[in-house]
């Protein structure tokens, strides 16, 4: 039977008189044009919708916007739009939202083609008070805070001026010219690179890195010949030219540019880009564009310095630069990632990573699934998710995956069971364990959020007609109801809840259409009444994360640890509650060989734990270039796995020798960097 | 200024299709509606259906419904109205009107502007 | 649909008169109501719309008013140009037209 139909699916009582006096609507008077939704701060019940609508006249487009402002999570809503003085807020710089719980708002004006600057509207109360400023110059980005202080804010200007306030946008002062890119590092520290010549269209790959860590009074050139620049967990990273061709490399520096060391990944040329698909303290995925129009490369991962990379995972679907990658972090299970691959037969299949990229594999067939058209063995097959490529595609998926940290091992995914990716109309899956085990949870697409730390999963089905149903599970996806929460139906645009997965409210955005009205409006349903009371200590199951073989010592072991998680059982209907935090107990496993990666020269053949020689390196000397030293490295081709925590058992020789010889990587050495003030 | 101009006059058999086109010129339909009101000899105004432009939606009216089909180009500001399986009753003044809509920027003004009507005649 | 019934159907009336015409919606309307003015082989003039609201360009001697379901177009003096025949239309949902009042001269 389908999922949500079986006989022992008990149903919540009388939950339709208890969702019907939590349902909220409100109509908003305006024009169907565009609608943003932004939270200010966290647990504080502050939404911000800004819709925008455009009026085409005969010579141009004018613009008209409101602003509406709700304090308890969506219920009720305030036109606030006099506070920013009925002016045309522009929607491609959306809300700026400070940082954490600052309750700062920046919103950037549109202004009049011949004013001397932009104008922002700024709230430091959650959106309560607006205070209007005129800017000396116009916005080319949306303003960024920076992360340790929202008192400070940049931007750069159409005419590419790196513009700074130390006063929340109050005053700005100009710090550099001739910027093209600039972004917040740790300890209020910009890095930014500038342009020589003409523009940063015609300099790139001449650009210079600068660093200022006084917002501007000094600066620091730290690197030459720069194509772009990343910043990824504690690891800066430089993509430089080199000097005799058009090829570029891969620098990075764990000291905020002082220092660089050349990356060990291949070389790309005008064609190829890198990307960091995910970095933290640990470690970095970088995915290296293959030559030619491929549409796919390979994901290397970084040691801990991020300098030595292995190979994780070849053919990795990345269409062009700033295109479209499935890769995913699964965020409810540590160490798990999802992504795609492109088959020699130009099929897309998904694979799963459960130990930070040491290996791939295939996801399980779901027991209640039957193998696609695609599959040539219609026993054997394997779950296929839609992420962003198939969405870019405009296949019938309207989310991706879906998982958060605080509702343990919940993964939530459109896909099909076969031997690939099919293009026929998706089902939605849920895995409550991390992405080894799966199951159908629904028929057809739809959209879906997490609500109270897993407690309830929320879904609405996506159809291009006009609806009025939504479904809840308060049992991880294994039963639904159906709630009707509005008696005409509108066109549905979206889901909206708080970020986090906290909150047990859930928005239901949409408008309804007439011949002569077309309103937006909002349906905000709570569902604190259904789950009636807090969770108690029996409500609650141990669990021991990444288990596949309970008889096995080992067994759950990942990255040197294992951890058992207190998990609300699927029987429990209760809150767990805003303040709900995850209790884990971690213990420390001996260390295997799946503790290790691969060293640089060694590579791990598929199903097989052990790292052997790459074949072109066989018999030659490991040597690479680091800190502007050559370093010889004796391996017996393994190295421990950033983050990995295993102690005794298997331990590999790893040994590096100083080669106390210069070996410089056409960047700008330590000594030669110079430092201006301003 | 807008203006509406539509296409002339039709004379069509029992049974055939006619497709009026309404042009606004001095101007784009943006969001506003577009109705076509028709005119029988003799007797009072009657709203078959209207579209609005932007949004590429249309209405019809109970009576015209699976009979009336009404388009919209946004990149020529032209509206069509075309009537299928014609009667001889259908024989009428055919108009398109501009109208705004009730709710956010546009504020409800009634028909402000009309089509100086076509002329369909259906006669065997 | 929302029926709109419309009185009297003609009225004859002379120059400076002042003249009334009623229109009645089957169900609440809010002021969602135009009144239009329509001379023979003409197309309809939009005189009065969201009930009470002059179109510009519109001489003041009509107005309008009522809401819910009753509504009046009055000419507070009728002049030679204003025989003509007047219909009102509401607009909450699709659209429909009263059946017509016609101003004749007495």
């Known amino acids: 039977s389908a999922p949500g139909e079986d006989e022992e699916c008990g149903r919540v009582r009388d939950f339709v008189a208890k969702l019907a006096n939590n349902t909220h609507q409100h109509v908003f008077d305006d024009l169907r044009g565009s609608v943003s939704l932004s939270w200010v701060g966290d647990s504080t019940g502050v939404i911000l919708v800004l819709t925008t609508f455009h009026v085409p006249l005969v010579i141009m487009t004018f613009g008209q916007s409101k602003l509406y402002r709700s304090e308890d999570y969506g219920k009720n809503f305030k036109d606030i739009t006099d506070l920013i003085n009925n002016t045309f807020i522009r929607t491609e710089f959306g809300m700026a939202i400070g940082p954490e719980n600052s309750g700062k708002v920046v919103l950037t004006a549109e202004v009049s083609g011949g004013s001397r600057g932009g104008r922002i509207f700024r709230s430091s109360d959650f959106a309560k008070n607006f205070v209007q400023t005129d800017l000396p110059f116009h916005p080319l980005t949306q303003m960024m805070y920076s992360p340790q202080n929202s008192d400070y804010l940049l931007a750069l200007s159409t005419e590419n001026g790196l513009w700074v306030s130390k006063n929340f946008g109050g005053k700005w002062e100009e710090i550099h010219k001739a910027v093209c890119l600039a972004k917040w590092g740790s300890d209020n520290t910009i890095f930014f690179t500038t342009y020589a010549n003409g523009s940063c269209k015609a300099d790139l790959g001449a650009l210079e890195l600068w660093r200022t860590s006084d917002l501007g009074k000094s600066f620091k050139t730290i690197g030459v010949k720069i194509y772009s620049f990343g910043l990824g967990g504690r690891f800066l990273f430089a993509s430089v030219m080199a000097d005799k061709d058009t090829t570029r490399r891969i620098h990075v520096s764990t000291d905020q540019g002082d220092t660089w060391s050349m990356a060990q990944l291949p070389s790309v040329g005008q064609e190829q880009f890198y990307s960091i698909l995910a970095a933290n303290d640990d470690m970095v995925f970088m995915h290296v564009d293959e030559p030619g129009d491929t549409g796919f490369g390979t994901i290397f991962t970084s040691d801990d310095r991020g300098i030595v990379y292995s190979k994780s995972l070849d053919r990795h679907l990345y269409t062009t630069t700033g295109g479209e990658t499935d890769f995913t972090n699964v965020t409810s299970l540590r160490g798990v990632y999802i992504t795609s691959v492109l088959s020699e037969d130009n099929s897309i299949q998904t694979m799963i990573t459960f130990d930070q990229g040491g290996r791939w594999t295939h996801l399980r067939k779901p027991e209640n699934s039957e193998c696609d058209a695609t599959a040539k063995n219609k026993n054997e097959c394997s779950l296929h998710i839609h992420a962003s490529y198939s969405i870019s595609q405009k296949l019938n998926v309207p989310m991706a995956p879906l998982s958060e940290p605080n509702a343990v091992g919940i993964v939530i995914a459109h896909g099909s069971v076969g031997d690939a990716i099919s293009v026929m109309v998706p089902d939605v899956y849920i895995s409550d364990d991390g992405g080894y085990s799966w199951t159908k949870m629904l028929e057809g697409p739809h959209y879906y959020t997490i609500l109270d730390s897993g407690g309830i999963i929320v879904a609405i089905e996506h159809s291009s007609r006009p609806i009025n149903v939504i479904k809840f599970s308060t049992d991880e996806g294994q039963c639904w109801q159906t709630y009707t929460f509005t008696r005409d139906p509108i066109y549905f645009t979206g889901l909206a809840s708080e970020p986090g997965a906290r909150s047990m409210n859930i928005s239901i955005w949409g408008f309804t259409e007439s011949f002569l009205t077309s309103q937006w409006v909002s349906y905000t349903i709570d569902f604190k009444d259904i789950l009636e009371r807090n969770c108690e200590e029996k409500d609650y199951t141990i669990w021991l994360a990444h288990s596949t073989d309970p008889e096995d010592y080992e067994d759950g072991c990942i990255l040197g640890y294992k951890e058992q998680f207190l998990r609300l059982r699927k029987s429990s209907v209760c809150q767990n509650g805003r303040d709900y935090v995850v209790t884990k107990q971690p213990s420390i496993c001996l260390c295997s060989l799946e503790d290790f990666l691969c060293d640089f020269g060694y590579y791990r053949p598929e199903n097989d734990s052990k790292c052997v020689e790459q074949p072109e390196l066989k018999g030659h000397d490991l040597e690479f270039c680091l800190y502007g030293r050559e370093e010889h490295l004796t391996t017996n081709g393994y190295r421990k796995i950033p983050g990995d925590k295993c102690q005794g058992g298997v331990n590999p020789v790893r040994e590096v020798k100083d080669l106390k010889k210069k070996c410089t990587s056409n960047f700008l050495s330590p000594e030669k960097q110079n430092s201006k003030s301003n | 200024q807008v203006q509406l101009v539509q296409s002339g006059a039709e004379v069509k058999k029992p049974g055939a299709s006619v497709k009026v086109s309404c042009k606004a010129s001095g101007g784009t339909f943006g969001s506003y509606a577009i109705s076509w009101v028709r005119q029988a000899p003799g007797q009072g105004l009657e709203w078959m259906g209207g579209i609005i432009p932007a949004f590429g939606t249309a209405w019809y009216a109970q009576k015209f419904q699976g009979r009336v089909t009404i388009t919209a180009d946004e990149s020529t500001s032209t509206a069509y109205m075309e009537l299928s399986s014609l009667r001889s009753e259908d024989t009428a003044v055919y108009y398109c009107?501009?109208?705004?809509?009730?709710?956010?920027?546009?504020?409800?003004?009634?028909?402000?502007?009309w089509g100086q009507g076509t002329t369909v005649t259906v006669s065997s | 649909d929302i029926q709109m019934t419309q009185s009297p159907s003609t009225l004859s009336a002379s120059v400076g008169d002042r003249v009334t015409i009623t229109c009645r919606a089957s169900q609440s309307i809010s002021s969602w109501l135009a009144w239009y003015q329509q001379k023979p082989g003409k197309a309809p003039k939009l005189l009065i719309y969201?009930?009470?609201s002059l179109e510009s360009g519109v001489p003041s001697r009509f107005s309008g008013s009522g809401s819910g379901t009753e509504f009046t177009l009055t000419i507070s003096s009728l002049q030679p140009d204003d025989f003509a025949t007047y219909y009102c239309q509401q607009a909450d949902g699709h659209i429909t037209f009263g059946g017509g009042t016609k101003v004749e001269i007495k």
């Open positions: 969201k009930a009470s």
């Open positions: 009107a501009r109208q705004g809509r009730k709710t956010g920027y546009y504020y409800y003004y009634g028909m402000d502007v």
